[in-house]
Amino acid sequence: LKGQEFAPSHQQVYAPLRADGDKPRAHLTVVRQTPTQHFKNQFPALHWEHELGLAFTKNRMNYTNKFLLIPESGDYFIYSQVTFRGMTSECSEIRQAGRPNKPDSITVVITKVTDSYPEPTQLLMGTKSVCEVGSNWFQPIYLGAMFSLQEGDKLMVNVSDISLVDYTKEDKTFFGAFLL
Amino acid sequence: LKGQEFAPSHQQVYAPLRADGDKPRAHLTVVRQTPTQHFKNQFPALHWEHELGLAFTKNRMNYTNKFLLIPESGDYFIYSQVTFRGMTSECSEIRQAGRPNKPDSITVVITKVTDSYPEPTQLLMGTKSVCEVGSNWFQPIYLGAMFSLQEGDKLMVNVSDISLVDYTKEDKTFFGAFLL
Amino acid sequence: LKGQEFAPSHQQVYAPLRADGDKPRAHLTVVRQTPTQHFKNQFPALHWEHELGLAFTKNRMNYTNKFLLIPESGDYFIYSQVTFRGMTSECSEIRQAGRPNKPDSITVVITKVTDSYPEPTQLLMGTKSVCEVGSNWFQPIYLGAMFSLQEGDKLMVNVSDISLVDYTKEDKTFFGAFLL
């Protein structure tokens, strides 16, 4: 029976039991970003801390050059929060000037890159219009979901504007994944 | 090594297999809060329901006096949502009066307390400026991520203003953790 | 005892080990919704994609007619994000007309239906007042938590207004659950 395991002793060949403690896992935290060039229609990717403070990678889950590397095929829960902060948005400036009221926005995308596939895949997107009355605004966007990933897949977090990301605290902006 | 673990094939000796059903888990739900004294620069902690309705604790994960007690070292997924509600924020009142436009804010922090360490550790923070036009506003802040915890660690949820927390429904404001 | 389990050492008899890969799991993604009739005080449920693109169901977790069917009792992590978008909210129109300033709102509810129980149970709710200055607004509501479910339970996602749901991209609006 697929979902019940009063299994014959040879079932481990097909779906081996494994200790939970040796599953690939990572929790990355924000670091100061350096402005980078990026294509006009492509959101820039964030850099992350992989070992200091609350951050860690374990069991062959490695971080390299903005990417989390998936070391083993399976179903992963992937999550990220990005806290944005800025001054009064253009939206309210435009509004005061009586021009058409087009809101600004903030966006986070968790993206999968597969070497064998030419286009990145957007797994998760959180996007929000920002049309604040206050002169200084700040707010988080949180994302999390489960995906089937293949060994060798790479994950990154892209944002609409790196200069608006709050990199001051490791608990405000973070990115993680773990094999279920 | 914190950031890398290339484990020998006999690791199961150190990380034994275990039934998923006996892992420490808790889902706590909101209760009416009693105003409590707290230090000026420290956010107050919320009380929680641990057994009625949707709430539960199991497998040695205990709730006591605002804290979730971690009974076993390992990697935990920790989450919380707090729904806030209030009247027109001071921000818009200040704005109408022509004074400097400093926004109010709402903040949730999931905090870890370790008896051997003098200072609490902020694991997760969700913080948002509130500068609403409407006379009554309400909104949730959601947080969730994975952390390596030690037996004996205690978790709590702190908020910037207890009086703004919506305690009317167990599905609006909650706090949980489970061993991965 | 619901809240406490001091289990005997032979508990594995009752909670057998099982391969993680054969646990019930689903990630559903948004599809275009058809306007449906619903009772005045009951939020409409969303339809979902269960196999195309990023969506999948596996290990007896089935999707049928707006519902995720729970095939096995246990503790599940359940999550959803709904991205809403709309034109200027009534709130600001009301405000301009000088009438009482009652904010609009957007709400997501993850609901459990148990055949043996007459009333659905609201597991998670995310609700937010919408009183936007900009003419076009958009924003996500994210929810996620762990619940003890019984075989045969059904899960659905209800929203306050189907016409405001952004169904354009599978990464913006989604719904998932997995057995822990």
């Epitope: 935290t29 670091v31 100061r32 200091l52 403070g53 001051t168 605290k169 | 950031g3 890398q4 | -």
Partner: antibody, heavy 123, light 107 residues
């Protein structure tokens, strides 16, 4: 411009405690974009990282296994400095000791160093 | 701990020569690799960070390349003031580890 100024005695007897201080100017010991490190150099061991202190959500310390049981690194926020205490020294601990800032961002590197303190361990 | 192995341990070259120093790591860590120059009696000075980025104020004759486990430092045209010992260092894993050094002498 960041500057690190080291101070401490230049000679320590075996079994005693080696104490050095590194005063920071142009940055803060509580910075979330740096770690504050001690590194030593000897002909036999080359450049050897000893440990660090840094602040994120709280203060953290990390130490090299070779000195973990004997080494304490403490930050002093009021004076914007950090210190090294190495207990029970032996002649093997004879080295030039450096403090260094590790800049933390997309990359990590020791971009500023103290001037170095030669510490002979001798009776 | 990650072992960093430099070669050669010393070299002698003439002014104007192109000089290459290599650094091998016992484990891959992408581009978290730095190069330092140390002149006698002074503290090490950062030359190259992130394998190939030139630190501000460092002459452009210095360059770095490589990723994973194999890295190189190149001095395109050796100058008299380049007489020093050069160290590689990985900054991905804790503890931080350095190569044993390459002493560059002028013929």
């Amino acid at each position: 411009q960041v500057q690190l100024q080291q101070s401490g005695p230049g000679l320590v007897k075996p079994s005693q405690t080696l104490s050095l201080t590194c005063a920071i100017s142009g940055d803060s010991v509580s910075s979330n974009s740096a770690t504050w490190n001690w590194i030593r150099q000897s002909p036999s061991r080359g450049l050897e990282w000893l440990g660090r202190t840094y602040y994120r959500s709280k203060w953290y310390n990390d130490y090299a296994v070779s000195v973990k049981s004997r080494l304490t690194i403490n930050p002093d926020t009021s004076k914007n400095q950090f210190s090294l205490q190495l207990n029970s020294v032996t002649p093997e601990d004879t080295a030039v000791y450096y403090c260094a800032r590790e800049a933390v961002g997309p990359t990590k590197d020791f971009d500023y160093w103290g001037q170095g303190t030669l510490v002979p361990v001798s009776s | 701990d990650i072992q960093m192995t430099q070669s050669p341990s010393s070299l002698s070259a003439s002014v104007g020569d192109r000089v290459t120093i290599t650094c091998r790591a016992s484990q891959s860590f992408s581009s978290y690799l730095n190069w330092y120059q140390q002149t006698p009696g002074k503290a090490p000075k950062l030359l190259i960070y992130a394998a190939s980025s030139l630190q501000s104020g460092v002459p452009s004759r210095f360059s770095g390349s490589g990723s994973g486990t194999y890295f190189t430092l190149t001095i395109s045209s050796l100058q008299p003031e380049d007489l020093a010992t050069y160290y590689c260092q990985q900054s991905y894993f804790t503890p931080r580890t350095f190569g044993q050094g390459t002493k560059v002498e002028i013929k």
